[in-house]
């Protein structure tokens, strides 16, 4: 009949049982084995299932399962006894906290539920199973109770613009195991952490330091706490408040001409910004505020202006952090005195503008004259230079023309000075220097070669490749050039009088 196992001993000290135990531990017995977990992890307050399942051969039975707490250095403490016939017995220390798992129950399952796990439950547990007929088995597991942290955020001292590195906030979280504390913010700062170990938990404190500036005002600073016992990170947000006070300025005097006798609705507005929000105070430096002047916070409203409203006005801005002043001089003008001054001002402006315009015009004329003279002189130099070159190369050019085939199209490409490249613009270079081009070998080509080249290029160009206007110009240029040459057997020969240089309308030297 079922018998239960004690905490200190697992059955009568009969040598039969000892043999059975030895056999089951050494694996020589064909008995089953206990299935359990090395570690069972629960969150504080949850129920912990302590698993212990006997997987045996058919016909084997579990008579009793005894659970005990067996922390090192302490005596075993009876937890519960699960008997195949008598049911569950819970020791007084665990009364009401140990239960069998809900049905359906397997007779080979010796698992128990430890309700509402507390930190003190953390430790080693042993499951001792009496099986029939195999004998007794035991297995150990470790219960780990996670204590989720309850983070707290403590703001640092009041932040003020101009302070150095200052504590913005500290965040503390205590749990088991030690939680992780980090910061999530757009604000630039530095963090430092420290931890304190307690007997069953650890507290972690992280501090966030920053150099306060007004741009940080209203920015969130979030403490993020991570822990295996939390389904998601815990976040505590602190809104930064940085005390500051901006320089004060006064608006309303941008157009002095509006401040004239009789004007209605004139006002001065004091501009500043601060945390905490500042208060405004208006005074007049050279006496009390004139009657009728309304003070409405940052605004000073005037009745219809009179000369007595002229004076120096001071806006005094202050908050708990600091105070600022800004002063302006109001000069209320008399419209009659003003009109003469205004006419003089316009006349003066017109004269100044006229003088500047005349000077600019003169400058332009001088530049144009100088440029035209420069170009004329340059052209003369070029003409002289070309005449000299033509005279020197003329005989040589005629000799070369005779020595070639009669059909100019059959000449090798290297004899052509300017190449069309299949593009009409190649004939339109505005620099006259491009006409007498030097080949790599240093050879130059005479007028005759250039004319033939132009003729050849014209034939090569497709009819639609250039604009109509350009085609006409090119044709006209060739016609004029042809007046100085005679065509014989497909070649051009210079007329006896054709010693001149012709520059076509586009500036090409022929």
């Amino acid at each position: 009949m079922p018998l239960s196992l004690g905490a200190e001993m697992w059955g009568p000290e009969a040598w039969l049982l000892l043999l059975l135990l030895l056999a089951s531990f050494t694996g020589r017995c064909p008995a089953g084995e206990l299935e359990t977990s090395d570690v069972v992890t629960v969150v504080l307050g949850q129920d912990a299932k302590l698993p212990c399942f006997y997987r045996g051969d058919s016909g084997e039975q579990v008579g009793q399962v005894a659970w005990a707490r067996v922390d090192a250095g302490e005596g075993a403490q009876e937890l519960a006894l699960l008997h195949s016939k008598y049911g569950l017995h819970v020791s007084p220390a665990y009364e009401g906290r140990v239960e069998q798992p809900p049905p359906p129950r397997n007779p080979l399952d010796g698992s128990v539920l430890l309700r509402n796990a507390v930190q003190a439950d953390e430790g080693e547990y042993e499951c001792r199973v009496s099986t029939f007929p195999a004998g007794s088995f035991q297995a150990r597991l470790r219960l780990r109770v996670l204590v989720p942290p309850l983070p707290s955020l403590n703001p640092g001292p009041a932040l003020e613009e101009g302070q150095g590195l200052t504590l913005a906030a500290s965040c503390t979280a205590e749990g088991s195991p030690a939680p992780s504390v980090t910061w999530d913010t757009e604000v630039k700062g530095t963090t430092s952490s420290r931890s304190f170990k307690h007997s069953r938990s650890a507290a972690v404190t992280s501090e966030f330091h920053l150099v306060p500036s007004r741009s940080m005002n209203g920015q969130p600073l979030t403490c993020v706490v991570s822990h295996p016992g939390l389904l998601q990170d815990q976040r505590i947000t602190h809104i930064l408040h940085v005390s500051f006070l901006a320089e004060a300025s006064v608006r309303g005097l941008e157009d002095q001409n509006l401040w004239h006798i009789g004007r209605e609705g004139a006002m001065l507005k004091c501009l500043s910004e601060g945390q905490p929000p500042p208060s405004y105070n208006w005074t007049r430096l050279d006496g009390p505020l004139p009657s009728g002047v309304r003070v409405d916070g940052d605004t000073l409203g005037f009745p219809p202006l009179t000369t007595e409203h002229s004076g120096i006005y001071v806006c005094h801005v202050s908050n708990e952090f600091s105070s600022r002043d800004s002063q302006v001089t109001v000069d209320v003008l008399d419209p009659q005195e003003d009109s003469g001054k205004q006419v003089d001002l316009v006349s003066a402006s017109v004269v100044v503008v006229g003088v500047i315009a005349a000077l600019l015009f003169c400058l332009l004329v001088v530049v144009v004259v100088l440029m035209s003279r420069y170009h004329r002189r340059k052209a003369q130099q070029m003409t002289q230079k070309y005449e000299e070159e033509l005279t020197l190369t003329r005989e040589n050019s005629i000799r070369r023309l005779h020595s070639h085939h009669t059909d100019p199209r059959s000449q090798p490409e290297e004899s052509v000075g300017l190449r069309a490249e299949g593009h009409p613009d190649s004939l339109k270079d505005n620099s006259s220097c491009s006409v007498m081009s030097e080949e790599p070998e240093g050879r130059s080509y005479s007028t005759l070669t250039t004319v033939r080249e132009i003729e050849t290029q014209t034939e090569l160009l497709s009819p639609g490749s250039g604009r109509a206007e350009e085609e006409e110009d090119q044709d006209e240029g060739i016609k004029q050039a042809m007046n100085h040459f005679v065509q014989e057997n497909g070649t051009l020969r210079a007329k006896p009088t054709g010693n001149g240089i012709y520059i076509n309308g586009r500036g090409h030297l022929v």
Epitope: M1, G6, A7, Q61, Y86, F132, P133
Partner: antibody
Framework: EVQLVQSGAEVKKPGASVKVSCKAS????????INWVRQAPGQGLEWMGG????????NYAQKFQGRVTITADESTSTAYMELRSLRSEDTAVYYC????????????WGQGTLVTVSS | DIQMTQSPSSLSASVGDRVTITCRAS??????LAWFQQKPGKAPKSLIS???SLQSGVPSRFSGSGSGTDFTLTISSLQPEDFATYYC?????????FGGGTKLEIK
């Protein structure tokens, strides 16, 4: 070695009560069930009831329900069986018995206590 | 309650004989069955547990078998000291019940 040592023989009158003790040694008394079995002269074995000391509650055979009380004192590792309203047919040898493997059967027996009910 | 019917109630045999005693349960008891030997004036002695497991110190001529409802105790070769009364016991459920016993006598 597991030993179950019972109290000595008793002679009782009909209607009286008898309390037999069984002191256990050699194993963890609290966790193992103690059974009480009786044997009338020339008769077979008859189970009366059993208890697991740590549980404190006992199971009884229907025949003896209300007349028998089985208790255990963990401090002295002693089990007790009290039978009330004794009749002549209660004359028998009363045995306490335990087991080698928790939860199963009967393996160890006390030497027995003879209770004689006679007027 | 589970009734245990043991047969025969008595048996005469000689030393060296092979003897078989049977025990039948009124309902299935798996292998929750034990066999005891009792000699006159002595407390019972456990021979076999779990229907077939020989207890420590018990000679190997004793063997048990069966499961469910039908069980047997066999003595392969009777020895003089084996003449006694034999009981079966079921401990599958409460109340625990014994068989009526088999008295083994010398022929």
């Amino acid at each position: 070695e597991v030993q179950l040592v019972q109290s000595g023989a008793e002679v009782k009158k009909p209607g009286a009560s008898v309390k037999v003790s069984c002191k256990a040694s050699g194993y963890t008394f609290t966790s193992y069930d103690i059974n009480w079995v009786r044997q009338a002269p020339g008769q077979g074995l008859e189970w009366m009831g059993g208890i697991i000391p740590i549980f404190g509650t006992a199971n009884y055979a229907q025949k003896f329900q209300g007349r028998v009380t089985i208790t255990a004192d963990e401090s002295t590792s002693t089990a007790y069986m009290e039978l009330r309203s004794l009749r002549s047919e209660d004359t028998a040898v009363y045995y306490c018995a335990s087991t080698a493997v928790a939860g199963f059967g009967i393996d160890y027996w006390g030497q027995g206590t003879l209770v004689t009910v006679s007027s | 309650d589970i009734q245990m019917t043991q047969s025969p109630s008595s048996l005469s045999a000689s030393v060296g004989d092979r003897v078989t005693i049977t025990c039948r349960a009124s309902q299935g008891i798996s292998n929750y069955l034990a066999w005891f030997q009792q000699k006159p004036g002595k407390a019972p002695k456990s021979l076999i547990s779990a229907a077939s497991s020989l207890q420590s110190g018990v000679p190997s001529r004793f063997s048990g078998s069966g499961s469910g409802t039908d069980f047997t105790l066999t003595i392969s070769s009777l020895q003089p000291e084996d003449f006694a009364t034999y009981y079966c016991l079921q401990h599958d459920s409460f109340p625990i019940t014994f068989g009526g016993g088999t008295k083994l006598e010398i022929k």
